[in-house]
């Protein structure tokens, strides 16, 4: 289980000529929504045919009016993600259609009208737990530019999402034949219980002892790459037994790379290279230069030797990625010391400081004691990179500057009065205690727990406490 | 505020070598990518070369492709041009300017320095 | 090779009166990730080096008066000075990115005079 993110970075007029008019005027204002179909595999079907991965719908975006004479801006955009659920595995190769819908807020009868606005779609493998996956598409004269990625709900991980993490049962390892799960290092694989031999990779199960296989892949276990090269020649074998799946010796049988790509194994899977001008798992996408604007944030596109080759961003400080679509997170690398906090500006980093350490990087710890004197005869304590005054008897605050009032946290047990003197103070016990604090019960008999009174003092009466 | 000054122009033979700096105040240096460009006199703008924020990136233009080095040190908050094999045609004022990753374009200058190339 | 051509190549205009330039580039100019493109203008006043006006074809620099403005698309685009004053008597110059190889290119400059 897991789920489909979609994010909408703008839609508005594609580049070249013939610029949409707006959707929207002063006497129409309208808002724009979006929605998303997923469908497993890469089959091109009809629109209207079922979103078996599922289906979501955006928020409303804000209300948008036609300035008279402008032409179409990028359209202001609903908040947030569109997630899509999926309860299965994520099966690694989708089919996408997004649709820009207009709800127009005038005065129709019967509340608002809709209408499709652009709708585009495409064909994408895509990996669970991988990054955003960035993307621009074009429906005649609108662009939309959108990025999208799959993560997996826990305890699923994986690239399909269909191995399960469990907490650890023993601090140190996991139980014998089971992986830690990474990112989540702390927990352990849950114990297979899968047919026995069903591929890891591409194989998963819902019941035990079951062995479905994802999209590319089938066999028993799950480990015969489809080869789909027989079923796109007229003049190759078709057979209704194999559906046109031949068996073949790896993952790059039948080169599942596009677009002139060139495939090589890897220990899980396959990975192409593909030419200039197209990217993508398998080479997929096309086309990308850098007269599509594909560099973020104030990145350098730079193209190949011509025109229609593909691109490079060189990124700003503070962003990466191949389009510098991502923030860097550079407080992640906690340049501050001493318990600064990081502030990413964008422009730049600071660190704002705890009292007693400064510097760019809270890197310089301050004398805390310099030049903080400790009024009325008390002493300057360094520590934790802030000062404290130790006061002398009778005087309290940050610098001693304040004259304490002994008798405030009522020190004079059982009911005895307190008296504020200049070199303390003095607790006046209630009849049958004494002591400094009045803390020591007179025995009936007129003996106390403590060593007789001092001479020429009752039991009872006030102790000055030194 | 945001100051560009350059130096190190003068009079120099053909096929000599010169080296022009140009040092930086009023913003953070070592996040900003610096060009040079050049300024024949009486004659239009013709871009030199440019050097990323990190110095890992260095572009030239065809003219000067081989003969000029960018480089830069960001804790001196300076910026060189590093000429060789000049030609009577580098002779030009030579400014440097900060470069502006909204626009791709150059939104401060220094007064420029100027190199004549002469036997 | 990428070319810039300004027309026309001086201008004399009276006080309070328009200034139009006009910059053609031999290939569509690049955009960035908003579609706005890559084309700034600037002005150089005798002995002064450049000041930059005009950034993304339309978008005034920081305490640029407003009497100046850009517009246009693709390969032909406009610096107009709404009302000519004493001070923008200068050279005035567009620049684009190239991006395959990277390369910023600089039109010959229009003078602009006062009639």
């Known amino acids: 289980a897991g789920v489909f993110e979609l994010q909408i970075h703008s839609f508005g007029p594609g580049p070249g000529p013939g610029a949409p008019r707006s959707p929207c005027s002063a006497r129409l204002p309208c808002r724009l929504f979006f929605r998303v179909c997923l469908k497993p595999g890469l089959s091109e079907e009809a629109a209207e045919s079922p979103c078996a991965l599922g289906a979501a719908l955006s928020a409303r975006g804000p209300v948008y009016t036609e300035q008279p004479g402008a032409p179409a801006p990028d359209l202001p955009l609903p908040d947030g993600l569109l997630q899509v659920p999926f309860r299965d595995a994520w099966p690694g190769t989708f089919s996408f259609i997004i649709e820009t819908w207009r709800e127009e807020l005038g005065d129709q009868i019967g509340g608002p009208a809709w209408s499709l606005l652009a709708r585009v779609a495409g064909r994408r493998r895509l990996a669970a737990g991988g990054p955003w996956a960035r993307d621009i598409q074009r429906a005649g004269a609108w662009e939309l530019r959108f990025s999208y990625r799959a993560r997996c709900e826990p305890p699923a991980v994986g690239t399909a999402c269909t191995r399960l993490c469990r907490p650890r049962s023993a601090p140190s390892r996991c139980g014998p034949g089971l992986r830690p799960c990474a990112p989540l290092e702390d927990e352990c694989e849950a114990p297979l219980v899968c047919r026995a031999g069903c591929s890891p990779e591409h194989g998963f199960c819902e019941q035990p002892g079951e062995c479905r296989c994802l999209e590319g892949w089938t066999g028993p276990l799950c480990t015969v790459p489809v080869s789909t090269s027989s079923c796109l020649s007229p003049r190759g074998p078709s057979s209704a037994t194999t559906g046109c799946l031949v068996p073949g010796p790896g993952p790059c049988d039948g080169n599942p790379c596009a677009n002139g790509g060139s495939c090589s194994e890897t220990p899980r899977s396959f990975e192409c290279t593909c030419p200039r001008g197209f990217y993508g798992l398998r080479c997929e996408v096309s086309g990308v230069t850098c007269a599509d604007g594909p560099c973020f944030n104030g990145g350098l596109c730079v193209g190949g030797a011509d025109p229609d080759s593909a691109y490079i961003c060189h990124c700003p400080p503070g962003f990466q990625g191949s389009n510098c679509e991502k923030r860097v997170d550079r407080c992640s690398l906690q340049p501050c010391r001493n318990g600064g906090l990081c502030l990413d500006l964008g422009h730049a980093l600071r660190c704002r400081c705890r009292a007693g350490f400064a510097g760019p990087r809270c890197e310089h710890d301050l004398d805390d004691c310099a030049g903080r004197a400790c009024a009325n005869g008390g002493t300057c304590v360094e520590g934790g990179g802030a000062h404290r005054c130790s006061c002398a008897l009778g005087f309290g605050g940050r610098d001693c500057r304040e004259r304490a009032d002994p008798c405030a946290a009522r020190p004079c047990a059982h009911g005895g009065r307190c008296y504020a003197h200049f070199s303390g103070l003095v607790c006046a016990c209630a009849p049958g205690y004494m002591g400094a604090r009045c803390e020591f019960p007179v025995h009936p008999d007129g003996a106390s727990a403590l060593p007789a009174a001092p001479p020429g003092l009752r039991p009872g009466d006030p102790q000055r406490y030194l | 505020q945001v100051q560009l000054v350059e130096s190190g122009g003068g009079v120099v033979q053909p096929g000599r070598s010169l080296r022009l700096s140009c040092v930086a105040s009023?913003?953070?240096?070592?996040?900003?990518?610096m060009h040079w460009v050049r300024q024949a006199p009486g004659k239009g703008l013709e871009w030199v070369a440019i050097?990323?924020?990190?110095?890992?990136?260095?572009y030239y233009g065809d003219s000067v492709k081989g003969r000029f080095t960018i480089s830069r040190d960001n804790s001196k908050n300076t910026l060189y041009l590093q000429m060789n094999s000049l030609r009577v045609e580098d002779t030009a004022v030579y400014y440097c300017?900060?470069?502006?990753?909204?626009?791709?374009?150059?939104?401060?200058w220094g007064q420029g320095t100027l190199v004549t190339v002469s036997s | 090779d990428i070319g810039m051509t300004q027309s026309p190549d001086s201008l004399a205009v009276s006080l309070g009166e328009r200034a139009t330039i006009n910059c053609k580039s031999s290939?569509?100019?690049?955009?960035?990730?908003?579609?706005?493109?890559?084309l700034s203008w600037y002005q150089q006043k005798p002995g002064q080096p450049p000041k930059l006006l005009i950034y993304?074809?339309?978008t005034r620099a920081s305490g640029v008066p407003d009497r100046f403005s850009g517009s246009g698309s693709g390969t032909d685009f406009t610096l107009t000075i709404s009302s000519l004053q004493a001070e923008d008597v200068a050279v005035y110059y567009c620049?684009?990115?190239?991006?395959?190889?990277?390369?910023?290119?600089f039109g010959q400059g229009t003078k602009v005079e006062i009639k």
């Open positions: 300017g900060r470069h502006d990753y909204g626009g791709n374009s150059f939104d401060y």
């Open positions: 009023g913003f953070t240096f070592s996040n900003c990518g």
């Open positions: 050097i990323w924020y990190d110095g890992n990136i260095k």
């Open positions: 290939q569509n100019v690049l955009p960035n990730s908003n579609k706005k493109h890559y």
């Open positions: 993304l074809a339309s």
């Open positions: 620049q684009q990115y190239y991006s395959s190889p990277p390369e910023w290119t």
